[in-house]
């Protein structure tokens, strides 16, 4: 029993960020005369939250009218709570002293915990594109959540991934936390339309997790396959040689025809066709006048895809015998080869 007790009935209070926290406090007596003050934390570094005597505290309102006679309810409300407001709050009775007020009695304290939602997960992939069969790393980051407990999962096209590492920082007590996770993904040729999803579940989200996505179309490079073929044309002494550029991604592609090593024509892929898997096909042709050549002609289709080293496929066109009629394939021999 004491001549005055300061009662803080709530050991802890949990509030969602953005809401209002009510911190309850009553005194058992109004004597001795002196103000009530609220502090966050204890000791010399404590932070003044509210002073009944003086000061301007725009975020704080008193639950009851402290100017009312015999009022012993010194509860306060703190508006627009953020994670930075977390801590232990003490209701402290001061008595008039000479010259300064003297701390008389403190409540036991109320721990304010702030539930803060994690930010939308941001997924980022590698800086440079990678080709199928390579393993690439994706990172996922989310910040500003509290309490610390959080669950993070990775998915590729709805299938949960298992090869990832996650850290929540800081390790110790903090007003809010951040999560950082790195997942490893093996690319396949079919991944142009694939998505990598980072899913974050937290108590503040009420069972509706946040998701961040990355499209593998930003990450993958599918190199083209080349096929050079020859078709006769109606006009005598002319051969149509086509270069089929298949299954490439992204679209950025430049093709150069070489006749016996000399550049004949360069063009950029424009009218491409898209495959179901998101890759592209493109075809280029070269009309070769056989009569203009005495010797065999080596035709090379050279493709530079997405700034990578050129890939080429060659076709030997023998000019010893000229095609006489449409459909005849005797005038040229296809001896294609891939060159890098």
């Amino acid at each position: 029993e004491e001549e005055l007790q300061v009662i803080q009935p709530d050991k802890s209070v949990l509030v969602a960020a953005g809401e209002t926290a009510t911190l309850r406090c009553t005194a058992t007596s109004l004597i001795p005369v002196g103000p009530i003050q609220w502090f966050r934390g204890a000791g010399p570094g404590r932070e003044l939250i509210y002073n009944q005597k003086e000061g301007h505290f725009p975020r704080v309102t008193t639950v009851s009218d402290l100017t009312k006679r015999n009022n012993m309810d010194f509860s306060i409300r703190i508006g627009n709570i953020t994670p930075a407001d977390a801590g232990t709050y003490y209701c402290v009775k001061f008595r008039k002293g000479s010259p300064d007020d003297v701390e008389f009695k403190s409540g036991a304290g109320t721990e304010l915990s702030v539930r803060a939602k994690p930010s939308a997960p941001v997924v980022s992939g590698p800086a440079a594109r990678a080709t199928p069969q390579h393993t690439v790393s994706f990172t996922c980051e989310s910040h500003g959540f509290s309490p610390r407990d959080i669950t993070l999962k990775w998915f590729k096209n709805g299938n949960e991934l298992s090869d990832f590492q996650t850290n929540v920082d800081p390790v110790g007590e903090s007003v809010s936390y951040s999560i950082h996770s790195t997942a490893k993904v093996v690319l396949t040729r079919e991944d142009v339309h694939s998505q990598v999803i980072c899913e974050v579940a937290h108590v503040t989200l009420q069972g509706d997790p946040l998701r961040g996505t990355a499209n593998l179309s930003e990450t993958i490079r599918v190199p083209p396959t080349l096929e050079v073929t020859q078709q006769p044309v109606r006009a005598e002494n002319q051969v149509n040689v086509t270069c089929q550029v298949r299954k490439f991604y992204p679209q950025r592609l430049q093709l150069t025809w070489l006749e016996n090593g000399n550049v004949s024509r360069t063009e950029t892929a424009s009218t491409v066709t898209e495959n179901k898997d998101g890759t592209y096909n493109w075809m280029s042709w070269l009309l070769v006048n056989v009569s203009a050549h005495r010797d065999d002609v080596k035709l090379t289709c050279q493709v530079e895809h997405d700034g990578q080293p050129a890939v080429s496929k060659s076709h030997d066109l023998k000019v010893s015998a000229h095609p006489k009629e449409q459909g005849s394939n005797t005038a040229a021999e296809n001896t294609g080869s891939n060159e890098r």
Partner: antibody, heavy 114, light 111 residues
Framework: QVQLQESGPGLVKPSQTLSLTCTVS????????VNWIRQPPGKGLEWIGI???????DYNSALKSRVTISKDTSKNQVFLKLSSVTADDTARYYC????????WGQGTTVTVSS | DIVLTQSPASLAVSPGQRATITCRAS??????????MHWYQQKPGQPPKPLIY???NLESGVPARFSGSGSGTDFTLTINPVEANDAANYYC?????????FGGGTKVEIK
């Protein structure tokens, strides 16, 4: 129940120090303050000072240079010392509990005389 | 120091009548919404007995015939109806500012 009892010499010589004890029961001296109040014969009440539960003290400025209030919590006793007494210090001395002065002792009469 | 002036210095009242004692402070004794003025009854040979605290609150065990009112600098103790054993000295006291002070007292006699 709450009780306070004052004790000490009934006669003190001028210029000497008056020493009184207030022995309390029914409450803790760590939880409650104790006041000293005096009443000269046929006159009104005068507050001397208080010792709070935490041991801090506040005194009447008119007596501050001469008065000391202390306590021994383990013995449930509060002490008043008033130095350099004169005949004007002749009075009945009371101890009373807390800032509210809700319980009083019966008082002890001190006469200052040679 | 806050000086408390009580009036009248004495009064005689018949049983069943109303007795009114006033206490005027030299400065306000109000703080934080409350008036730190209290009233005590003292009978001969006895210590003061608390009657009213914080201007208007009845101490436990005190009959409802006693009531207190006022704020700031002007306060009143009312006994209604007066009974024979209410004969005593009545003191107001403030503990809003140091030094805590008492009024000079009012002697109530029963006719």
């Amino acid at each position: 129940q709450v009780q306070l009892q004052e004790s000490g010499p009934g006669l003190v010589k001028p210029s000497q120090t008056l020493s009184l004890t207030c022995t309390v029961s029914g409450f803790s001296l760590t939880g409650y303050g104790v006041n000293w109040i005096r009443q000269p014969p046929g006159k009104g009440l005068e507050w001397i000072g208080i010792i709070w539960g935490d041991g801090s003290t506040d005194y009447n400025s008119a007596l501050k240079s001469r008065v000391t209030i202390s306590k021994d919590t383990s013995k449930n006793q509060v002490f008043l010392k008033l130095s350099s007494v004169t005949a004007d210090d002749t009075a009945r001395y009371y101890c009373a509990r807390a800032g509210k002065m809700d319980y009083w002792g019966q008082g002890t009469t001190v006469t200052v005389s040679s | 120091d806050i000086v408390l002036t009580q009036s009248p210095a004495s009064l005689a009242v018949s049983p069943g009548q109303r007795a009114t004692i006033t206490c005027r402070a030299s400065e306000s004794v109000d703080s934080y919404g409350n008036s730190f003025m209290h009233w005590y009854q003292q009978k001969p040979g006895q210590p003061p007995k608390p009657l009213i605290y914080l201007a208007s609150n009845l101490e436990s065990g005190v009959p409802a015939r006693f009531s207190g009112s006022g704020s700031g600098t002007d306060f009143t103790l009312t006994i209604n109806p007066v009974e024979a054993n209410d004969a005593a000295n009545y003191y107001c006291q403030q503990n809003n500012e140091y030094p805590w002070t008492f009024g000079g007292g009012t002697k109530v006699e029963i006719k």
